[in-house]
C-alpha cells in the first residue's frame, strides 16, 4: 500500500469511575499509517509534558498499521477540573498530527442523607418490629460507608446495606445512591430512642437523627362525609343504607365510625377500612343498613367517627328532605332512526325520561325479561327540566347492532321512581313499533331478586 | 322451628385451644348477627364477640385477640376460636340471634350451651 | 364488676308486684334500648323484654319494662311461683363497642 499518515481517535474510558482507583487513564489510537514508524507525545494543556505513558506494539491490517497509546493521570488533578482535556501527539514520516483528548469530569458531590420512620401502625410480628430506611443520595465518587448508631453506640444487628447504585440521570455527571435499614422494636422506639444514621464520604461524616419524638404530628385533615341512600339502591337491594365515608386517615387502627338515630340510639354499623392510598393515608367506610320506614319519616341519623389524631369526635348527620314535591316521570322509548339502520351497523334506542321530581331516578334495560349488561347502555345524570322549574330529565342510550334490531327482538326500557305507582314503569319497543309501547306494570319483585 | 345449638367445648388446659361451633335451624341464617354469651359457674352473663351478617365482627376486651368469631352461611354455622385459653375463660358458652337486623334490640334466640373447663 | 349495675336479689310473694332496677350511663342505657332477660335454673337466658318495654310474644303481660335517663326498671305484676329465676338487664355500649349486661337479679318467690 501507499505510504500514509495516521488518523487519530481520543480514548476515554466508558465507565465514569475514575475516582474508584488513584489513576485515570485515557488514550489515543492512531490508524491506517505507513510505513511501521510512529512515536506518541503527551502534553497537558498547558504544554507540559505527561511522563506516565505506555505504547503498545503496532497491529498491521489490511495492509496499514494501527497502534495505540496510554497515559495514566493522577485522578486527584482529574476530579480538580483544570484540564479539560490533554494532548495526543504523534510523529510520522507522512506527517505528525495531534489530538484533544477529553478528561472525564469527576465531581466531588456530597451526599444528601434521609431517615424514613414507619407509620404508628408499622410494628408487625412478636415482638412488633419495623425498619428504619436510611437512604444516601446524589454523591460521588461511589466510596461510601454506612453506618447505624442508637444513643450514640454503634449498631451490630440487624443493619442491611444495599450494594451503591449510579443514579439514573440523562446528563452531568455521575451520581450514586446507596440505602440501608435498621430493624428495630416497637419497644424501643416508642421508648424514644434516638437513632442515628451516619455516613462517612471523601473524609467527612453525614448524620441523620430518627426517633419517635422528632415525628411531627401531621394537621388533622379527617373529613367525613354522611352519604344518604339512593332510590337505586334502596329499589335495587331492598334495603336502606347509610354510608359514613371518612378520609385522610394517618392510621387505620384506631378510628371508630359508629351511626347513631336520632334519639341517641346505636345503629349497627359495619366498618371497612381502605388499603394505603399513595399519599400514605386511608380511608375508611362505616355503613349501616336500617329500616326504610325510619328514613322515610324524615329521622335525622348521625355518624360519629373518632380517631386518634382527632381532640374531638367528628358528626354528620343526615336526613331525608322533606317537602320535596313528588311528581311521577313520563317515559318515552324512542327506536333507532331509519337513517342510522340505513348504515347497517348499530341501532341505538333512547329511552327519554322526563317531569320527575325528586332527582333520584333508577333506569335498567330489559331483553326477553333478563336485565341486559349495563355495559351496553349509558344513562344520563337526572338535569333540570328547563321549562319545569323543580322536575328533572334523564335519558338511558341503548346500543344493538342492526341485524339484533332487524330480527324483531324486543327492547324494554324499566324505569324506577319513588313517585310512581308501584314504583316501576315499563315501555318496549321491537323493530314492528311504530311509536313507543307503555306498559304500568305491577308485580316486578322477581326482577330485583336477580 | 327456630333452633341454634351449641357444640365443641371440653375441658382444655390453660394457653391452649379449642374450636366452638353453632349449627342454625329455621331461620335465614345469613341475614342475622349472632353473638356468642358465656356464663361462667355461678356468675352472670358476659357477651363475648358478634359477627354481623356484613362480617364484621367485635369483641369483649377480655378475649380480645384471643377469639376469633366467624360464620359459614352456606352451613348456617357460627364458630368461635378461642386461644390462650385460660381458667377465667371457664364457661357456659351461648351462641345468640340478634333480634333486629338494624338495631341493638336483644337476642331472641339461645343455644342450650356449651361447657368449656380450662384446667390443668 | 358488671357495667350496668342490678341488685343481687330481689323477692316477694305470689300475687305481688315487684320491681328490678338496672342502672348505667349515657353510654348504654341513656342512648340505647335496655332488654331484659330470664333465666330460669339450668336452661339458656330468655329474652322477656326488648326495646325498654316491647314484650316479644309468648311473654305474658304481668312482665313490663321502663327506662328513663340511664336507668331501667323490670316490673313483675301477679307474681308467680314459676318467674323465681335471674333476671338480666342488657344494653348496647356505644364506648365498648358491645353488649353489656348487668349481673343479675335472684327473684325468689317466698
Known amino acids: 500500500g501507499s505510504a500514509s499518515a495516521p488518523t487519530l481517535f481520543p480514548l476515554v474510558s466508558c465507565e465514569n469511575s475514575p475516582s474508584d482507583t488513584s489513576s485515570v487513564a485515557v488514550g489515543c489510537l492512531a490508524q491506517d499509517f505507513l510505513p511501521d514508524s510512529i512515536t506518541f507525545s503527551w502534553k497537558y494543556k498547558n504544554n507540559s509534558d505527561i511522563s506516565s505513558t505506555r505504547g503498545f506494539p503496532s497491529v498491521l491490517r489490511g495492509g496499514k498499521y494501527a497502534a495505540t497509546s496510554q497515559v495514566l493521570l493522577p485522578s486527584k488533578d482529574v476530579m480538580q477540573g483544570t484540564d479539560e482535556h490533554v494532548v495526543c501527539k504523534v510523529q510520522h514520516p507522512n506527517g505528525n498530527k495531534e489530538k484533544n483528548v477529553p478528561l472525564p469530569v469527576i465531581a466531588e458531590l456530597p451526599p444528601k442523607v434521609s431517615v424514613f420512620v414507619p407509620p404508628r401502625d408499622g410494628f408487625f410480628g412478636n415482638p412488633r418490629k419495623s425498619k428504619l430506611i436510611c437512604q444516601a443520595t446524589g454523591f460521588s465518587p461511589r466510596q461510601i460507608q454506612v453506618s447505624w448508631l442508637r444513643e450514640g453506640k454503634q449498631v451490630g444487628s440487624g443493619v442491611t446495606t444495599d450494594q451503591v447504585q449510579a443514579e439514573a440521570k440523562e446528563s452531568g455527571p455521575t451520581t450514586y445512591k446507596v440505602t440501608s435499614t435498621l430493624t428495630i422494636k416497637e419497644s424501643d422506639w416508642l421508648g424514644q430512642s434516638m437513632f442515628t444514621c451516619r455516613v462517612d464520604h471523601r473524609g467527612l461524616t453525614f448524620q441523620q437523627n430518627a426517633s419517635s419524638m422528632c415525628v411531627p404530628d401531621q394537621d388533622t385533615a379527617i373529613r367525613v362525609f354522611a352519604i344518604p341512600p339512593s332510590f337505586a339502591s334502596i329499589f335495587l337491594t331492598k334495603s336502606t343504607k347509610l354510608t359514613c365515608l371518612v378520609t385522610d386517615l394517618t392510621t387505620y387502627d384506631s378510628v371508630t365510625i359508629s351511626w347513631t338515630r336520632q334519639n341517641g340510639e346505636a345503629v349497627k354499623t359495619h366498618t371497612n377500612i381502605s388499603e394505603s392510598h399513595p399519599n400514605a393515608t386511608f380511608s375508611a367506610v362505616g355503613e349501616a343498613s336500617i329500616c326504610e320506614d325510619d328514613w322515610n319519616s324524615g329521622e335525622r341519623f348521625t355518624c360519629t367517627v373518632t380517631h386518634t389524631d382527632l381532640p374531638s369526635p367528628l358528626k354528620q348527620t343526615i336526613s331525608r328532605p322533606k317537602g320535596v314535591a313528588l311528581h311521577r316521570p313520563d317515559v318515552y322509548l324512542l327506536p333507532p332512526a331509519r337513517e342510522q339502520l340505513n348504515l347497517r351497523e348499530s341501532a341505538t334506542i333512547t329511552c327519554l325520561v322526563t317531569g320527575f321530581s325528586p332527582a333520584d331516578v333508577f333506569v335498567q334495560w330489559m331483553q326477553r325479561g333478563q336485565p341486559l349488561s349495563p355495559e351496553k347502555y349509558v344513562t344520563s345524570a337526572p338535569m333540570p327540566e328547563p321549562q319545569a322549574p323543580g322536575r328533572y330529565f334523564a335519558h338511558s342510550i341503548l346500543t344493538v347492532s342492526e341485524e339484533e334490531w332487524n330480527t324483531g327482538e324486543t327492547y324494554t326500557c324499566v324505569v324506577a321512581h319513588e313517585a310512581l305507582p308501584n314504583r316501576v314503569t315499563e315501555r318496549t319497543v321491537d323493530k314492528s313499533t311504530e311509536g313507543e309501547v307503555s306498559a304500568d306494570e305491577e308485580g316486578f319483585e322477581n326482577l330485583w331478586a336477580t | 322451628e327456630v333452633q341454634l345449638l351449641e357444640s365443641g367445648g371440653g375441658l382444655v388446659q390453660p394457653g391452649g385451644s379449642l374450636r366452638l361451633s353453632c349449627a342454625a335451624s329455621?331461620?335465614?341464617?345469613?341475614?342475622?348477627?349472632m353473638n356468642w354469651v358465656r356464663q361462667a359457674p355461678g356468675k352472670g352473663l358476659e357477651w363475648v364477640s358478634v359477627?354481623?351478617?356484613?362480617?364484621?365482627?367485635y369483641y369483649a376486651d377480655s378475649v380480645e385477640g384471643r377469639f376469633t368469631i366467624s360464620r359459614d352461611n352456606s352451613k348456617n354455622t357460627l364458630y368461635l376460636q378461642m386461644n390462650s385459653l385460660r381458667a377465667e375463660d371457664t364457661a357456659v358458652y351461648y351462641c345468640?340471634?340478634?333480634?333486629?337486623?338494624?338495631?341493638?334490640?336483644?337476642?331472641?334466640?339461645w343455644g342450650q350451651g356449651t361447657l368449656v373447663t380450662v384446667s390443668s | 364488676q358488671s357495667v350496668l349495675t342490678q341488685p343481687p336479689s330481689a323477692s316477694g310473694t305470689p300475687g305481688q308486684r315487684v320491681t328490678i332496677s338496672c342502672s348505667g350511663s349515657?353510654?348504654?342505657?341513656?342512648?340505647?334500648?335496655v332488654n331484659w332477660y330470664q333465666q330460669l335454673p339450668g336452661t339458656a337466658p330468655k329474652l322477656l323484654i326488648y326495646?325498654?318495654?316491647q314484650r316479644p310474644s309468648g311473654v305474658p303481660d304481668r312482665f313490663s319494662g321502663s327506662k328513663s335517663g340511664t336507668s331501667a326498671s323490670l316490673a313483675i305484676s301477679g307474681l308467680r311461683s314459676e318467674d323465681e329465676a335471674d333476671y338480666y338487664c342488657?344494653?348496647?355500649?356505644?364506648?365498648?363497642?358491645?353488649?353489656?349486661f348487668g349481673g343479675g337479679t335472684k327473684l325468689t318467690v317466698l
Open positions: 345468640a340471634r340478634d333480634t333486629n337486623p338494624y338495631y341493638y334490640y336483644g337476642m331472641d334466640v
Open positions: 329455621g331461620f335465614t341464617f345469613g341475614s342475622y348477627e
Open positions: 359477627i354481623y351478617s356484613g362480617g364484621s365482627t
Open positions: 349515657s353510654s348504654n342505657i341513656g342512648n340505647n334500648a
Open positions: 326495646r325498654n318495654n
Open positions: 342488657q344494653s348496647y355500649d356505644s364506648s365498648l363497642n358491645g353488649q353489656v
